[in-house]
């Protein structure tokens, strides 16, 4: 059951984080203009990682995509391709981790398929996360760097009366959504990892077998109870003993069958 | 076509208070941002009031700020201007205005004469 | 506050004769997003309100003749009249609309010589 809650909660939080990452790749407000010297700017303009715009007090917005490919920064074509590994990483582990799901039946499938199914998907969760982490930060470094440069040359023409205010650019929302999304597919991933343990076949199973001391006789009555980690299941079937005690698959075939010796 | 028709001027104390109404046809008053412009006689113009579309904004400049409030009733297709504390120099004609692209006034109504004088 | 100079501040000239006009702000109305320059040329006749002529220094309004041109960038702009007719006979302002508050040059009366 705890595995069952474990692999869906992984699912449904990795679920979410790459809506997320899908969503912060597609938001406009990657960086936005900074407001500090002029809160009450006429004309706002914001940026994202395949067009810029601006919006006009009156209510207009424009935006323009970036169609030139080359003429980019690196920088902004290495997040753009870590925020699409991310994705395409992401979307990937969504579609093994809805096969890996103990509580969807595929044919015949074994347990063991499933639990490495699950962990495939947990890493790729894992590392779609930290693409989107990676991404989000390596922009977030670019418009720190950008921002300090143009503080120091904030105005950059000084003849006279004249002066150009140099447009700073600061956080948008995109990011804090990269972050949050990216940490949550984290988590999803870890948990995918977590409950593949649980959903692993386990060679030996100890069984509990209970002993009645009457006199001198002793009696043992059989009991499908594991003695192990409570996740594994006995694939093999292995009998203890063979007049007595069974595996728990056993006990559940026969219910009303008891064995004494 | 659209128009813009400004009412509520006239003559006050230095002092006192009125609201200056416009309002609006024939074009989709709820997705413009509205200003108020001034004109002194024989004076160059000034802006006065800016309320963004979804009455979330507004923008004034030092000169009637505290004193002036913009707003609007989308539903009544109305833009209002209360003027509190009224001095001699903002005796103007008063003007709505629609803005535009590029932030610029589109649409103008006639103006309102506002005399402010004891 | 951003400061708007208009010159002249009245200009006579010849009907079908060029007429050009200049304003100057203070700081640069560039927008750096969208590479446009906020400024908005308006014609005012007497006893009328003001008419958008052309925004973003250059566009013209709909409905506007095509002999009034908007040119210039940053600080220095030109509304040029490329051939005066009569009914061009007005004052012409020039407006930042790039930063609040929005600020009106002084305006410059147009004449027939």
């Known amino acids: 059951m705890a595995v069952t809650a474990c692999q869906g909660l992984g699912f449904v939080v990795s679920l979410i984080g790459i809506a997320g990452i899908i969503a912060a790749t597609c938001m406009d407000q990657w960086s936005t203009q900074d407001l500090y010297n002029n809160p009450v700017t006429a004309v706002f303009n914001y940026q994202g990682l395949w067009r810029s715009c601006v919006r006009e007090s009156s209510g207009f917005t424009e935006c323009r995509g970036y169609f030139t490919l080359l003429g980019l920064p690196a920088m902004l074509q290495a997040v753009r391709a870590l925020m699409i590994v991310g994705i395409v990483l992401g979307a990937i582990g969504l579609l093994v981790s809805i096969f890996a799901l103990k509580c969807i039946r595929i044919g015949s499938m074994e347990d063991s398929a499933k639990a490495n199914m699950t962990l495939t998907s947990g890493i790729m969760f894992i590392v779609s996360g930290l693409c989107a982490i990676a991404g989000v930060s390596v922009f977030a470094n670019m418009l720190v760097t950008n921002f300090w440069m143009s503080t120091a040359n904030m105005y950059t023409g000084m003849g006279g009366m004249v002066q150009t205010v140099q447009t700073r650019y600061t956080f948008g929302a995109a990011l804090f959504v990269g972050w949050v999304a990216g940490g949550l597919t984290l988590i999803g991933g870890v948990m995918m990892c977590i409950a593949c343990r649980g959903l692993a076949p386990e060679e030996t199973n100890y069984k509990a077998v209970s002993y009645h001391a009457s006199g001198h006789s002793v009696a043992y009555k059989p009991g499908g109870f594991k003695a192990s980690t409570g996740f594994g299941s006995n694939t093999k079937n292995k009998k203890i003993y063979d007049g007595g005690a069974r595996t728990e698959d056993e006990v559940q075939s026969y219910p009303s069958k008891h064995d004494y010796v | 076509e659209v128009q813009l028709l400004e009412s509520g001027g006239g003559l006050v104390q230095p002092g006192g208070s009125l609201r200056l109404s416009c309002a609006a046809s024939e074009f989709t008053f709820s997705n413009y941002a509205m200003s108020w412009v001034r004109q002194a006689p024989g004076k160059r113009l000034e802006w006065v009031a800016t309320i963004s579309s979804g009455r979330s904004s507004t923008y004034y400049p030092d000169s009637v700020k505290g004193r002036f409030t913009i707003s609007r009733d989308n539903s009544k297709n109305t833009l209002y201007l209360q003027m509190n504390s009224l001095r001699a120099e903002d005796t103007a004609v008063y003007y709505c205005a629609g803005l535009g692209r590029g932030n610029a006034m589109e649409y103008w109504g006639q103006g309102t004469l506002v005399t402010v004088s004891s | 506050d951003i400061v708007m100079t208009q010159s002249p501040d009245s200009l006579a000239v010849s009907l079908g004769e060029r007429a050009t006009i200049s304003c100057k702000s203070s700081?640069?109305?560039?927008?750096?997003?969208?590479?446009?320059?906020?400024l908005t040329w308006y014609q005012q006749k007497p006893g009328q309100p003001p008419k958008l002529l052309i925004y973003?220094?250059?566009t013209r309004e709909s409905g506007v003749p095509d002999r009034f041109t908007g040119s210039g960038s940053g600080t220095d702009f030109t509304l040029t009249i490329s051939s005066l007719q009569a009914e061009d006979v007005a004052v012409y302002y020039c407006q930042n609309a790039y930063s609040y508050p929005f600020t009106f040059g002084g305006g410059t009366k147009l004449e027939i010589k």
């Open positions: 973003w220094a250059s």
């Open positions: 700081q640069s109305l560039l927008n750096s997003g969208n590479q446009k320059n906020y």
